[in-house]
C-alpha cells in the first residue's frame, strides 16, 4: 500500500513501503521478492482502473 499523501509512482515503477520510495519494476528481475514487485505484477492497464474503481 502506498503511503498516504505521496504522489503516485510513474509508469513502470511501484511503491516500496520497505524503502519508502517508488522503485523500478525492472529491478524485480534481479530481486523478485521485493515488496514492491507485487504491485508491478498486479497493476492492471489504466483504462480498467478508470472503468472499475
Amino acid at each position: 500500500e502506498q503511503a498516504p499523501g505521496t504522489a503516485p509512482c510513474s509508469r513502470g515503477s511501484s511503491w516500496s513501503a520497505d524503502l519508502d520510495k517508488c522503485m523500478d519494476c525492472a529491478s524485480c528481475r534481479a530481486r523478485p521478492h521485493s515488496d514492491f514487485c507485487l504491485g508491478c505484477a498486479a497493476a492492471p492497464p489504466a483504462p480498467f482502473r478508470l472503468l472499475w474503481p
Partner: antibody
Framework: EVKLEESGGGLVQPGGSMKLSCVAS????????MSWVRQSPEKGLEWVAE??????????HYAESVKGKFTISRDDSKSRLYLQMNSLRAEDTGIYYC??????????WGQGTSVTVSS | DIVLTQSPASLAVSLGQRATISCRAS??????????MHWYQQKPGQPPKLLIK???NLESGVPARFSGSGSGTDFTLNIHPVEEEDTATYYC?????????FGGGTKLEIK
C-alpha cells in the same frame, strides 16, 4: 544525504596484500547490494566484485581477473564494505570505488581510493 | 562476457546543440519489457554519476535535457540542448548478467 567513503589505498609491492574499506551512511545499507569497481587509464571502468544481502546468504561474485585473489565482505552492523586484495600485480593499479545499488544500476558511488602496485 | 562498444570515442558539440552517444552490446540485454542498460556521467576528479537506468529512466535530479533510448543491442544517450556543465566522459553499463561491463567511454567537449 548518501555518503560512501573508501579508505585503505596506497602503494604496495607486487605480490603484496591490501585491505580496502568503505563506510556507508544515508541509506539502508543492509538492503543494498554492494560492489567494488576500479578505474585505470588502461582498462577504463572495470567491475571487480559484488556482495548481496543476508537473505541471499551474502552471495558474492567476482570478475574472472580477481577470482581467488580478492575477497569481498560486508558488516551490516557497521555499514561497512571490505575488499581484501592478495597477490597484487601491476594490472591491479587504479582507483577503487565502492558502489551501492538496489539492483542493476549503481546508484551510489564513493570518491574512490587509489591503489598503486609497484616496486 | 558482454562487450559494450561506445561511439564516438570523443565528440565536440556547440553550446545548445544536440549530443548523441551510441552504445552497442555484443548480445541483447533486453527482455520484452525492460532493457538492462544504464548511463553514467563522469567529470574529471569525480566518481561516475548515474544518469539513466533501464535504458530510458531518468535518475532523480538529472536534467530533462538528458534522455536515453534503445533496446536489444543498440542504445543511445542524447543531450539536448548541451550546456557547458555537460563537459564530461559518458559511460554505458549493462546488468544483464555477471560480469557487469562498462563501455570504453565517450568524452564530450562543448564548443
Amino acid at each position: 544525504e548518501v555518503k560512501l567513503e573508501e579508505s585503505g589505498g596506497g602503494l604496495v609491492q607486487p605480490g603484496g596484500s591490501m585491505k580496502l574499506s568503505c563506510v556507508a551512511s544515508g541509506f539502508t545499507f543492509s538492503s543494498y547490494w554492494m560492489s567494488w569497481v576500479r578505474q585505470s587509464p588502461e582498462k577504463g571502468l572495470e567491475w571487480v566484485a559484488e556482495i548481496r544481502l543476508k537473505s541471499d546468504n551474502y552471495a558474492t561474485h567476482y570478475a574472472e581477473s580477481v577470482k581467488g585473489k580478492f575477497t569481498i565482505s560486508r558488516d551490516d552492523s557497521k555499514s561497512r564494505l571490505y575488499l581484501q586484495m592478495n597477490s597484487l600485480r601491476a594490472e591491479d593499479t587504479g582507483i577503487y570505488y565502492c558502489t551501492g545499488y538496489y539492483a542493476d544500476a549503481m546508484d551510489y558511488w564513493g570518491q574512490g581510493t587509489s591503489v598503486t602496485v609497484s616496486s | 562476457d558482454i562487450v559494450l562498444t561506445q561511439s564516438p570515442a570523443s565528440l565536440a558539440v556547440s553550446l545548445g546543440q544536440r549530443a548523441t552517444i551510441s552504445c552497442r552490446a555484443s548480445q541483447s540485454v533486453s527482455t520484452s519489457s525492460y532493457s538492462y542498460m544504464h548511463w553514467y556521467q563522469q567529470k574529471p576528479g569525480q566518481p561516475p554519476k548515474l544518469l539513466i537506468k533501464y535504458a530510458s529512466n531518468l535518475e532523480s535530479g538529472v536534467p530533462a535535457r538528458f534522455s536515453g533510448s534503445g533496446s536489444g543491442t543498440d542504445f543511445t544517450l542524447n543531450i539536448h540542448p548541451v550546456e557547458e556543465e555537460d563537459t564530461a566522459t559518458y559511460y554505458c553499463q549493462h546488468s544483464w548478467e555477471i560480469p557487469y561491463t562498462f563501455g570504453g567511454g565517450t568524452k564530450l567537449e562543448i564548443k
